[in-house]
């Protein structure tokens, strides 16, 4: 009888440590994404980007999916939400036709089921990039904490997309579930 | 019968509590690291930043270590990192050596095992701080999600360390494990 | 027997589940609280923000309190906290008084057993808002991993209240907790 | 309809100086860069300058650095090319042309002035 | 600064007959930042084609621009009489802004 339950108990222990193994990875979806530099739209409005990487690089991707330049959420919950946005100018890369710019970053949540688009985040600066400097550069960070619901895509939204900078450390988006909904 | 049953039973909650109190503890590892600023090397140039508290006022670690300027990772997994970094400049320092500065911040990883070292995240702006202005200050935030291995090392590097602003609150950096690999 | 002790596994399995649910909710508090720009202070010195949504739009808070404009920490952890805060002008709000600006953040921790504030993180940039140009934007975000004991207060102070941006995607703050104390 | 009018062409002996000027109209002049283009007798084109829409930015070709400055007077919706220490190699027709405003680095060139010639010869 | 290369010089093509210039870079022009333009004898040039593919205003279909990198093609379908002129390249992805030499298409 002993024998048996101490059997038991290992079952209880082993498919405890299974579970809660199993149930905690499944309950920690992420994404880091990076830009894709060689499908950077030009002008300077605000645009929609749609070109990153998601398996190179820093870049990596579990249990979201990236899908038509969105982050689309695949399990309810409250994420940590960031974005890194470095524009940068050179005197070689062209000459700037004005020296006054608007920087930005929108980070937007779309709901499918509700068609909706909402900015969840925003940041940036107007900023004075004078001819007389041969090289300008300038970032936005931007995070916050947000309740996120199966279905629904993350997309960034910026100003000047010509200006942004292409490396996989200046350029990126991401997220991290941190609990469920009660 | 029974009694040896619940005996069990309590072994098994008790263990249980006591495994997922220390699984959970010793899964997420951290680091808030604040500038020490009896060290801060001088020039322009970009340098690597050694000096930082780790059990003083803000700054705390556990199971992290901090040797030779850098966060040393001792456990596999997914973390965020962050760093900010504030400049300032008042003229009651001297005068500015250039109003044309660069200022920037770099977080670096390196692999011991693979003796290499990569930019994970970088932030920053040129600015022009005028003499026309007795006081200047600009702050830089990073953060992003990233796979860490035992072994792999953290470090910043900035531009103009001379700017710096010593305090805790301004320039620090951090880390915590949010989960592991699969 | 055998029967029993399965019931007994069961209640086991069951009586974890709960706990381990409720445990990891409980063990997670969080807020996101964005500006509530009906009681925004006027001036340009530094001032405590103490209107701020919990509870419409992107604005949530769970076990923690938000009370007399402070974010009330209801149970000790290790806690990443953040803030974005948005400043802007526009021609059409009339002249600024100075064209050189200080816009800062401070994010303060108060304890009311040891009756005393600290400030944690700060961030933001001095700037020439010429008028020349007739919008101005800049934003700033901080954030950092702080331990925080049951009864600690966190609040917001700003320079230049008077030209916060009021949208809740551009000036709000926020925490959630990561971690235990060991 | 956006139009550009050129002036200010003429015969100038080696060393000597011109100004050229253009005349815009019929867009919000001061919201867009503008350049000067040249086309040697029988040649080819080649950017000599541009300024942003505010005025603030300047930029020239190598050839003609230090020699030319490029100005404009929003007020007066007129773009101006003042050229001294002229060569027998800047002999060419100057045309004004409008940046499109579209991106923020200066881009392609449309419309385009009709174009003035100077001749600079003993 | 990057060196735009035209070829052919001249082209001799009768109306109705499609024409292919090509216009070559010294280095790849980010963007693709390329525009066309066609000049008639005693006129100022006139846009065609800009980001290597995209019509300007007015600009008939049978005008058609592609390419990226090093190497960016004018096709014009079907050569209407007043087709004929001096076609222009012209790089904007790098500083100086700078043309090709010129493809002259001319009547056969």
């Known amino acids: 009888g002993s024998q048996h339950i101490r059997a038991e108990k290992a079952m209880v222990d082993g498919s405890w440590l299974d579970l809660a193994k199993r149930s905690k990875l499944e309950a920690q979806p992420f994404a880091h994404l990076t830009i894709n530099a060689t499908d950077i739209p030009s002008g300077s409005h605000k645009v929609s980007l749609s070109s990153w990487y998601h398996d190179r690089g820093w870049a990596k991707i579990s249990n979201m999916t990236f899908s038509n330049g969105k982050l689309i959420v695949n399990q309810d919950g409250f994420y940590y939400l960031y974005a890194n946005i470095c524009f940068r100018h050179h005197e070689t890369s062209g000459d700037l036709a004005t020296e006054y710019l608007q920087l930005m970053v929108y980070v937007t949540k779309t709901s499918i089921k509700i068609p909706s688009s909402h900015t969840l985040m925003k940041g940036g600066s107007t900023k004075y990039w004078s001819g007389n400097s041969e090289f300008h550069f300038y970032s936005i960070n931007v995070g916050g904490f947000f309740k996120l619901r199966s279905g629904e895509e993350i997309s960034i939204e910026v100003s000047n997309p010509s200006l942004l900078d292409p490396d996989q450390d200046a350029t990126y988006f991401g997220a991290f579930k941190v609990r469920d909904i009660d | 019968g029974s009694q040896h049953i619940r005996a069990e039973k309590a072994m098994v909650d008790g263990s249980w509590l006591d495994l997922a109190k220390r699984s959970k503890l010793e899964a997420q590892p951290f680091a808030h690291l604040t500038i020490n600023a009896t060290d801060i090397p001088s020039g322009s140039h970009k340098v690597s930043l050694s000096s930082w508290y780790h059990d003083r006022g803000w700054a705390k670690i556990s199971n992290m270590t901090f040797s030779n300027g850098k966060l040393i990772v001792n456990q596999d997994g997914f973390y965020y990192l962050y760093a900010n970094i504030c400049f300032r400049h008042h003229e009651t320092s001297g005068d500015l050596a250039t109003e044309y500065l660069q200022l920037m911040v770099y977080v670096t990883k390196t692999s011991i095992k693979i003796p290499s070292s990569h930019t994970l995240m970088k932030g920053g702006s040129t600015k022009y701080w005028s003499g026309n202005s007795e006081f200047h200050f600009y702050s830089i935030n990073v953060g992003g999600f990233f796979k860490l291995r035992s072994g792999e090392e953290i470090s910043i590097e900035v531009s103009n360390p001379s700017l710096l602003d010593p305090d805790q609150d301004a320039t620090y950096f951090g880390a915590f494990k949010v989960r592991d690999i699969d | 027997g055998s029967q029993h002790i399965r019931a007994e596994k069961a209640m086991v399995d069951g009586s974890w589940l709960d706990l381990a649910k409720r445990s990891k909710l409980e063990a997670q508090p969080f807020a996101h609280l964005t500006i509530n720009a009906t009681d925004i202070p006027s001036g340009s010195h530094k001032v405590s923000l103490s209107s701020w949504y919990h509870d419409r739009g992107w604005a949530k808070i769970s076990n923690m309190t938000f009370s007399n404009g402070k974010l009330i920490v209801n149970q000790d952890g290790f806690y990443y906290l953040y803030a974005n805060i948005c400043f802007r002008h526009h021609e059409t709000s009339g002249d600024l008084a100075t064209e050189y600006l200080q816009l800062m953040v401070y994010v303060t921790k108060t304890s009311i057993k040891i009756p005393s504030s600290h400030t944690l993180m700060k961030g933001g940039s001095t700037k020439y808002w010429s008028g020349n140009s007739e919008f101005h934007f800049y934003s700033i975000n901080v954030g950092g991993f702080f331990k925080l004991r049951s009864g600690e207060e966190i609040s917001i102070e700003v320079s230049n209240p008077s030209l916060l941006d009021p949208d809740q995607d551009a000036t709000y703050f926020g925490a959630f907790k990561v971690r235990d104390i060991d | 309809e956006v139009q550009l009018l050129e002036s200010g062409g003429g015969l100038v002996q080696p060393g000597g100086s011109l100004r050229l000027s253009c005349a815009a109209s019929?867009?919000?002049?001061?919201?867009?860069?503008m350049s000067w283009v040249r086309q040697a007798p029988g040649k080819g084109l080649e950017w000599v300058s541009g300024?942003?829409?505010?005025?603030?930015?300047?930029y020239y070709a190598d050839s003609v650095k230090g020699r030319f400055t490029i100005s404009r007077d929003n007020s007066k919706n007129t773009l101006y090319l003042q050229m001294n220490s002229l060569r027998a190699e800047d002999t060419a027709v100057y045309y004004c042309?409008?940046?499109?405003?579209?991106?923020?680095?200066?881009?392609?060139?449309?419309?385009w002035g009709q174009g003035t010639l100077v001749t600079v010869s003993s | 600064e990057i060196v735009l290369t035209q070829s052919p010089g001249t082209l001799s093509l009768s109306p109705g007959e499609r024409a292919t210039l090509s216009c070559r870079a010294s280095?790849?022009?980010?963007?693709?930042?390329l525009a066309w333009y066609q000049q008639k004898p005693g006129q100022a040039p006139r846009l065609l084609i800009y980001?290597?593919?995209s019509r300007a205003t007015g600009i008939p279909d049978r005008f058609s621009g592609s390419g990226s990198g090093t190497d960016f093609t004018l096709t014009i379908s079907r050569l209407e009489p007043e087709d004929f002129a001096v076609f222009y390249c012209?790089?904007?992805?790098?500083?100086?802004?700078?043309f090709g030499q010129g493809t002259k298409v001319e009547i056969k």
């Open positions: 280095q790849s022009i980010p963007g693709p930042r």
């Open positions: 019929g867009f919000t002049f001061s919201s867009y860069a």
């Open positions: 042309a409008k940046d499109p405003g579209t991106t923020v680095i200066m881009s392609w060139f449309d419309p």
């Open positions: 980001g290597a593919s």
């Open positions: 300024i942003t829409g505010s005025g603030g930015s300047t």
């Open positions: 012209q790089q904007y992805g790098s500083s100086p802004r700078t």
